[in-house]
């Protein structure tokens, strides 16, 4: 599986901020089915796209947490968004609709970085960061920031601080973080590759 | 399909700049990365660098940096390099390549343009 | 910047023999490696990715194969139309880089 964890972080995180505002307000009312919790207001209003895709799927699963996110953003007029994350889904069970042939599994979504295709997946698992901090350091990742995810106590959460810094990054920088892993922990891409 | 089609060949003098066009069709140029290599004469390929269209960034080979320019229109979903100060050593077949794959690990080139030969002579 | 090593520069065999072409990387490039053919005045076309992928409609006599800084391309039982130069190109690190080439020409 996570496959629909990763189309539903996708989703999110290709939201504004004030769509994913929206989002969030909307999941407080969304009906649920029966047997479902609704997660608790003040968690929710806190979390980035990432912490809600762990909440969504802890809560209701991966595939009903997909259908969830898809209901949401088509209650939100955002149509095209929920077909895409229902389609990624079908694809990862197997399943395509009647007369539509699924895609590859290496039809990624196009235009979207390697890292930003895999970001929940490297966030835990990448465990040489303090190796793609100094790979970094100077041409991507500025003092500050070096020291900032440095002072984050665990992998996840330095791999967690790394990432808030990439929507700045242009296709490049995003590269040479992608070398620095290939380099440092090639079989964790070779895995994701065929993820 | 996937067509990537450059502009015809350049004869140039030494030191003047060209600048040479690779057109692409049948996917969207935004969401991939373009590729430039030469070839000189009886010499192997060489890797001279890439731009992204979709934000603009490009990656170098130092070897080349401030010879090439690399410059991407996504009116006209063309790529584009210059080609600076001009020497006999600039001579060559220089190729537009599409990777198999933009958001996979590496970068295979499975889409070529046909070339264009560049010849810097007095 | 990562050295590609191809050997041999040139090589001659016979029809329906099975050739062998080695590359080796100065350092250790994993399996992030693929092999090009290139015919006279034609294209450079992409054969293998990641070592041992055959690329889309090349036939299943091209193999190949190696990991982190020894690799081969092998072709069995050797067609006419598969003269022309071999180049193997890391993708590893940046600057990508190619192999020297190997130009295979029929006995």
């Known amino acids: 599986m996570g496959r629909a964890r990763d189309a539903i972080l996708d989703a999110l995180e290709n939201l504004t901020a004030e769509e994913l505002k929206k989002f969030k307000l909307k999941l407080l009312s969304v009906p649920l089915r029966e047997g479902y919790g609704r997660i608790p207001r003040g968690a929710l209003l806190s979390m980035d796209a990432l912490d809600l895709t762990d909440k969504l799927v802890s809560f209701y699963l991966e595939t009903y947490g997909a259908e969830l996110t898809a209901n949401v953003l088509r209650d939100m007029g955002l149509q095209e968004m929920a077909g895409q994350l229902q389609a990624a889904t079908h694809q990862g069970s197997g399943a395509a609709p009647a007369g539509i042939q699924a895609p590859p599994q290496s039809a990624a979504k196009p235009g979207l970085h390697f890292i930003d295709q895999h970001r929940a997946a490297l966030i835990a698992r990448v465990t040489n960061v303090e190796w793609l901090l100094d790979a970094l350091y100077g041409k991507v990742l500025t003092d500050e920031q070096y020291q900032a995810v440095r002072a984050e106590p665990t992998n996840p959460s330095k791999m967690r601080k790394l990432f808030s810094f990439t929507p700045a990054w242009n296709w490049t920088c995003k590269d040479l973080l992608l070398q620095a892993l290939r380099e440092s922990q090639s079989y964790l891409v070779e895995d994701l590759e065929r993820s | 399909q996937v067509q990537l089609q450059q502009s015809d060949a350049e004869l140039v003098k030494p030191g003047a700049s060209v600048k040479i066009s690779c057109k692409i069709s049948?996917?969207?140029?935004?969401?991939?990365?373009i590729h430039w290599m030469n070839q000189r004469p009886e010499q192997g390929l060489e890797w001279i660098g890439y731009i992204y269209p979709g934000d603009g960034s490009a990656m170098y080979n130092e070897k080349f940096r401030g010879k090439a320019t690399l410059t991407a229109d996504k009116s006209s979903s063309t790529a584009y390099m210059q080609l600076n100060s001009l020497t006999s050593e600039d001579s060559a077949v220089y190729f537009c390549a599409r990777p198999l794959y933009s958001y996979a690990s590496y970068y295979w080139f499975a889409y070529w343009g046909q070339g264009t030969l560049v010849t810097v002579s007095a | 910047d990562i050295q590609m090593n191809q050997s041999p520069s040139s090589l001659s065999a016979s029809l329906g023999d099975t050739i062998t072409i080695t590359c080796h990387a100065s350092?250790?490039?994993?399996?992030?490696l693929s092999w090009y053919q290139r015919k006279p005045g034609n294209i450079p076309k992409l054969l293998i990715y990641?070592?041992?992928n055959l690329h889309t409609g090349v036939p299943s006599r091209f193999s190949g194969s190696g990991s982190g800084t020894g690799f081969t391309l092998t072709i069995s039982s050797l067609q006419p139309e598969d003269i022309a130069t071999y180049y193997c190109?890391?993708?590893?690190?940046?600057?990508?880089?190619f192999g020297g080439g190997t130009k295979l020409e029929i006995k």
């Open positions: 049948g996917y969207t140029f935004t969401d991939q990365t």
């Open positions: 990641k070592s041992s």
């Open positions: 190109q890391q993708g590893q690190s940046y600057p990508l880089t």
């Open positions: 350092q250790n490039i994993n399996v992030w």
